[in-house]
Interface confidence: low
Amino acid sequence: MMTGTIETTGNISAEKGGSIILQCHLSSTTAQVTQVNWEQQDQLLAICNADLGWHISPSFKDRVAPGPGLGLTLQSLTVNDTGEYFCIYHTYPDGTYTGRIFLEVLESSVAEHGARFQIP
């Protein structure tokens, strides 16, 4: 029986050209997380495997950074990045849990865009 629940950043907005952090957390289960997939609609963005670490899809490697934690950082946002994002937790023995985040990328207003930073 699957007892876990996923908490996510939910519906979020960001400005064109900026960056955003997507985060999910699986709770209320003792199941072992073997892998987390991050997907945008039907496209795979990144995988975090418990044994092998992170893999970023080649088509996103210039704009996607792993972390913090099991989260994902999207950079240099465009209006085309608007849409649904999914964190898919593969666990044993429970199976698969999925969290949904909706991102809306807005046309830039007058904004001070963030400095570069390092995600461990």
Epitope: T8, T9, I12, S13
Partner: nanobody, 113 residues
Framework: EVQLVESGGGLVQPGGSLRLSCAAS????????MGWFRQAPGKEREWVAS???????WYADSVKGRFTISADNSKNTAYLQMNSLKPEDTAVYYC???????WGQGTLVTVSS
């Protein structure tokens, strides 16, 4: 006007404590995520901790067990309680929201005897 204002930094001896605050104002939507970053002299800005609106927290390995992040959603304010400070925690500390588009001036934390 959009603003993130950090405060609470200062000079503290190794093993001491500080509590940082970050007040966010002027935003049209409330953040689902708030976090703290830091930048030591000559280094890139690095993530320290973050908290979801629902209360779940994440920490960089270097601060786990020593730092505690929290947020008061009604005030759009985030806090970072820093205990057992080490000289390597010396840095300018910045807070951020989920969009990472806005940064304040930061608050300097110096850990030295």
């Amino acid at each position: 006007e959009v603003q993130l204002v950090e405060s609470g930094g200062g000079l503290v001896q190794p093993g001491g404590s500080l509590r940082l605050s970050c007040a966010a104002s002027g935003f049209t939507f409330s953040p689902s995520w708030m976090g703290w970053f830091r930048q030591a002299p000559g280094k890139e800005r690095e993530w320290v901790a973050s908290v979801l609106r629902g209360g779940y927290t994440w920490y960089a390995d270097s601060v786990k067990g020593r730092f505690t992040i929290s947020a008061d959603n009604s005030k759009n304010t985030a806090y970072l309680q820093m205990n057992s400070l080490k000289p390597e925690d010396t840095a300018v500390y910045y807070c951020a929201r989920d969009d990472l588009d806005y940064w304040g001036q930061g608050t300097l934390v110096t850990v030295s005897s």
